[in-house]
């Protein structure tokens, strides 16, 4: 019993399908009953490899793993003709991981694996700062999203004013985090930030406003 | 479905501009950039810039930086090129296109600007 | 500015054959990469991005793959109707730029 399908890595965007091939072939001497098995072995290692369906005596079981529940399917009607390949439907975050296809027809026995990552736009930036917006004061403006595959890239842009960024943010424009050291009123502006990955771009907006700094006389 | 509406052709004379238009439709304007290429006859794409409704931050090619001007108006869910100075080389046909990230999902039908005397 | 260069320029097959057209960066790309159809008097149209991902639509028998600063796109089973010009460009850092195209026609 041999899977003809090589190891590969699989590349798809969240709330598509995932095809995994697992084709095999089986040698005359292979007669005992066909036993098809896929787990998933999550990228979060929280878990050991898992059952997410199984093929034995004729019946399908896909009921195993209840965060792919109702999103994995052989795609063949006819199993025993030699192919195993599944589909995983609206992908999630959750499906990245290692997929193993064992297949079982005694005395032969084979598996396969394949890598599933699901690459995720990003959304949900928020830009904020994080200290006093004072002058003369140091603090950190930052940019968030809530969700997106790495690597991110990054992108402060000045919108108001002259639009240019201070010279001392320059090293810092393609970072999440800006550290703004000694504020001067001249900072204040509208900047915005986008964050990008190869799949898409999200952008979000902060409004500075440095100020002189409150009278703290008690 | 998406929709990027554009004005079909534009005649004008050496040294004068023309302010070409891109009406969206069918997705939320202010959450996507949207990309101008230039297209000469028979020739390959240029990427001249993109601007990002929401905000109106820009991002140009160098190259077309004293040529070309970015601009939008979210009431009508319209972006606006304007190209300054024509010359014979301004004569392409220029698109608009919407970015999912910085590759063009959805593209207009393109506008033919023929620099002429 | 990072230069896309993209071979063959032009490539004749017949119906049912499959084809592959390459991309060539001249810098890393880290899969920053996109695939265009481009038929006769029409607008270009997304095939596909991020290297490898198929846009909504697009026939299964289009596939992109490649890592670094080499790419491919292969038409599978090749159709009448996929006689246009094809560009690949990146976005990995301004300004985005576009290979110069391949011209695919049918025997």
């Known amino acids: 019993l041999s899977i003809t399908t090589p190891e590969e890595m699989i590349e798809k965007a969240k709330g598509e399908t995932a095809y995994l091939p697992c084709k095999f072939t089986l040698s005359p001497e292979d007669q005992g009953p066909l036993d098809i098995e896929w787990l998933i072995s999550p990228a979060d290692n929280q878990k050991v490899d898992q059952v997410i369906i199984l093929y034995s005596g004729d019946k399908i079981y896909d009921d195993y793993y209840p965060d792919l529940k109702g999103r994995v399917h052989f795609t063949s009607n006819d199993l025993k003709s030699g192919d195993a390949s599944i589909n995983v439907t609206n992908l999630q975050l959750s499906d990245i991981g290692t997929y193993q296809c064992k297949v079982k027809k005694a005395p032969g026995v084979a598996n396969k694996k394949i890598h599933l990552v699901v690459l995720v736009k990003p959304s949900g930036a928020r830009c904020y700062v994080d200290g006093s917006e004072e002058i003369g004061s140091d603090f950190k403006i930052k940019c968030e999203p809530k969700e997106g595959s790495l690597p991110l890239q990054y992108e402060w842009q000045k919108l108001s004013d002259s639009q240019k960024m201070p010279t001392s943010w320059l090293a810092e424009m393609t970072s999440s985090v800006i550290s703004v050291k000694n504020a001067s009123s001249e900072y204040s502006g509208t900047y915005s930030c986008t964050v990008r990955n190869r799949v898409g771009s999200d952008q979000c907006l902060l409004r500075l406003n440095v100020v002189p700094p409150s009278n703290k006389a008690g | 479905q998406v929709q990027l509406q554009q004005p079909g052709a534009e005649l004008v004379k050496p040294g004068a501009s023309v302010k070409l238009s891109c009406k969206a439709s069918?997705?939320?304007?202010?959450?996507?950039?949207i990309n101008w290429v230039k297209q000469r006859p028979g020739q390959g794409l240029e990427w001249i810039g993109n601007?990002?409704?929401?905000?109106?931050?820009?991002k140009y090619n160098e190259k077309f930086k004293s040529k070309a001007t970015l601009t939008v108006d979210t009431s009508s869910s319209t972006a606006h090129m304007q190209l300054s100075s024509l010359t014979s080389d301004d004569s392409a046909v220029y698109y608009c296109?919407?970015?999912?990230?910085?590759?063009?999902?959805?593209w207009g039908q393109g506008t033919l600007v023929t620099v002429s005397a | 500015d990072i230069q896309m260069t993209q071979s063959p320029a032009s490539l004749s097959a017949s119906v049912g054959e499959t084809v592959t057209i390459t991309c060539r960066a001249s810098?890393?790309?880290?899969?920053?990469l996109a695939w265009y159809q481009q038929k006769q008097g029409k607008s270009p149209q997304l095939l596909v991005y991020?290297?490898?991902l198929l846009a909504d639509g697009v026939p299964s028998r289009f596939s992109g793959s490649g890592s670094g600063t080499q790419y491919s796109l292969k038409i599978n089973s090749l159709q009448s109707e996929d006689v246009a010009r094809y560009y690949c460009?990146?976005?990995?850092?301004?300004?985005?730029?576009f290979g110069g195209g391949t011209k695919l026609e049918i025997k």
């Open positions: 296109a919407k970015g999912d990230g910085d590759y063009f999902a959805d």
């Open positions: 069918g997705y939320t304007f202010t959450s996507y950039w």
């Open positions: 601007i990002y409704p929401g905000s109106s931050s820009t």
């Open positions: 810098e890393n790309i880290d899969s920053y």
């Open positions: 991020a290297a490898t």
């Open positions: 460009q990146h976005y990995y850092s301004t300004p985005w730029t």
